[in-house]
């Protein structure tokens, strides 16, 4: 019988008949080791590979370039998959991006992009996006014209300032841009008026820090 093909992403996992959300192992092109990821099989048809998740502030997201490159945290909770893995996955085929957000009042919203990929490390993991829709604001809170990834030890933003140092976390900062889902986690009551919080400008404004976020990707042809 034909040898089983390894899963490239959570879409492959779903299409193989595994339709429960949870942790699965995927084999990404050009990556030497398999990678454990959280697969969301519930939202909008399932098949989503989670690349970022925030929910309780248990994980420190104020990290350097190398850690954002290779990832940190645990897919069972808060984590960043790793820019090298995100680059490798989104180089396999065309992907869309969905971002799920929740505020401290329990309101949920999402932003979705028809096309999503990032450049390689030499390109500072530059963000490429097209086709924004969703309920988290009419305008995109991610820079559509492209932005390089910055961390506290790698200042690639478009500002006279150092966005990643000032706003904390690694992100595709512009100057500094309308979002930062890797900012400081602030609890209820402490989450207003924060420059360096978990921000999605067109959902809750420039200084409201969100309660939970999930970034996930799925092939366009799913």
């Amino acid at each position: 019988r034909e040898e089983e093909k390894p899963f490239r992403d959570c879409a492959d996992v779903y299409q193989a008949g595994f339709n429960k959300s949870g942790i699965y192992t995927i084999y990404i092109n050009n990556m030497p080791e398999p990678k454990k990821v959280f697969c969301n099989m519930d939202v909008n048809g399932g098949g989503w590979t989670v690349i970022q998740h925030r929910e309780d502030g248990s994980l420190d997201f104020q990290r350097g370039w190398k850690e954002y490159k290779m990832g940190f945290g645990n897919p069972s909770g808060e984590y960043w998959l790793g820019n090298e893995f995100i680059f490798a996955i989104t180089s396999q085929r065309q992907y869309m991006l969905r971002i799920e957000l929740m505020d401290w009042e329990g309101n949920r919203a999402y932003s979705q992009y028809d096309r999503f990929h990032i450049g390689n490390e030499k390109q500072n993991y530059r963000l490429y996006l097209k086709g924004h829709t969703g309920t988290a604001g009419k305008q995109s809170s991610l820079i559509l014209h492209g932005a390089d990834f910055s961390t506290k030890d790698a200042d690639n933003d478009n500002c006279m300032c150092k966005c990643a140092l000032m706003l904390t976390g690694g992100w595709w900062f512009d100057a500094c841009g309308p979002s930062n889902l890797n900012g400081m986690f602030y609890t209820a009551g402490q989450n207003h008026g924060k420059l360096n919080g978990i921000k999605w400008h067109y959902f809750k404004g420039p200084s409201y820090s969100l309660r939970s976020t999930t970034m996930m990707i799925r092939p366009l042809d799913f």
Partner: antibody, heavy 122, light 112 residues
Framework: EVQLVQSGGGVVQPGRSLRLSCAAS????????MHWVRQAPGKGLEWVSY????????YYADSVKGRFTISRDNAKNSLYLQMNSLRAEDTAVYYC???????????????WGQGTLVTVSS | DIVMTQSPLSLPVTPGEPASISCRSS???????????LDWYLQKPGQSPQLLIY???NRASGVPDRFSGSGSGTDFTLKISRVEAEDVGVYYC?????????FGQGTKLEIK
């Protein structure tokens, strides 16, 4: 390269009007709050007015409230200051200045125009 | 309005020597978000002001590392570790924690 090029200054009699312009280039103008700051001859700096990126929020210094009007045209990448009922004490070099950070996060003036002199004299 | 008081108002310095400018505010500039909205600007002769330090201690891009800002609450300091001839001009502190934004009266740095 970020540029703020000012125009519209000159000599005007007390009680008359003048309109200053500030043409922006090299950045996404519609994403930034903008300010007017002035400097009387031989004196220090004084903040005059602020307008948010969309134009929905506007503030004025008490010394100009009711006489000056700040506005912006994001389609033309331009900032304006309409100055009415001018007084001798309004004589100053007027600077337009851009917020350091986008999306109306206040952290100071990242870029300044070259300044334009307004002289109010009879 | 918040009153910003700088000292000294005049500062003659020998090239290569350090320099220090103090800025005091009439109320605390420490915002509830943990930031001090205090900037330092330099206005060189015949030029527009330029941003040196933002949020109390953050050096703007392109500003030499001989410039540093420190302080919190009501007392702030701008230090130049080794003054160079190109550093001459008037230095202003400015607060934006409380509306309206207000400037200090300026400190004129000159070379001895």
């Amino acid at each position: 390269e970020v540029q703020l090029v000012q125009s519209g200054g000159g000599v005007v009699q007390p009680g008359r009007s003048l309109r200053l312009s500030c043409a922006a280039s090299g950045f996404t103008f519609s994403s930034y709050g903008m300010h007017w700051v002035r400097q009387a001859p031989g004196k220090g700096l004084e903040w005059v007015s602020y307008i948010s990126s969309s134009g929905s929020t506007i503030y004025y210094a008490d010394s100009v409230k009711g006489r000056f009007t700040i506005s912006r045209d994001n389609a033309k990448n331009s900032l304006y200051l309409q100055m009415n009922s001018l007084r001798a004490e309004d004589t100053a070099v007027y600077y337009c200045a851009r917020d350091l950070l986008d999306y109306d996060i206040w952290t100071g003036y990242g870029y300044w125009g070259q300044g334009t002199l307004v002289t109010v004299s009879s | 309005d918040i009153v910003m008081t700088q000292s000294p108002l005049s500062l003659p310095v020998t090239p290569g020597e350090p320099a220090s400018i103090s800025c005091r505010s009439s109320q605390s500039l420490l915002h509830s978000n943990g930031y001090n909205y205090l900037d330092w600007y330099l206005q060189k002769p015949g030029q527009s002001p330029q941003l040196l330090i933002y949020l109390g201690s953050n050096r703007a891009s392109g500003v030499p590392d001989r410039f540093s800002g420190s302080g919190s609450g009501t007392d702030f300091t701008l230090k130049i570790s080794r003054v160079e001839a190109e550093d001459v001009g008037v230095y202003y502190c400015m607060q934006a924690t409380h509306w309206p934004p207000t400037f200090g009266q300026g400190t004129k740095l000159e070379i001895k």
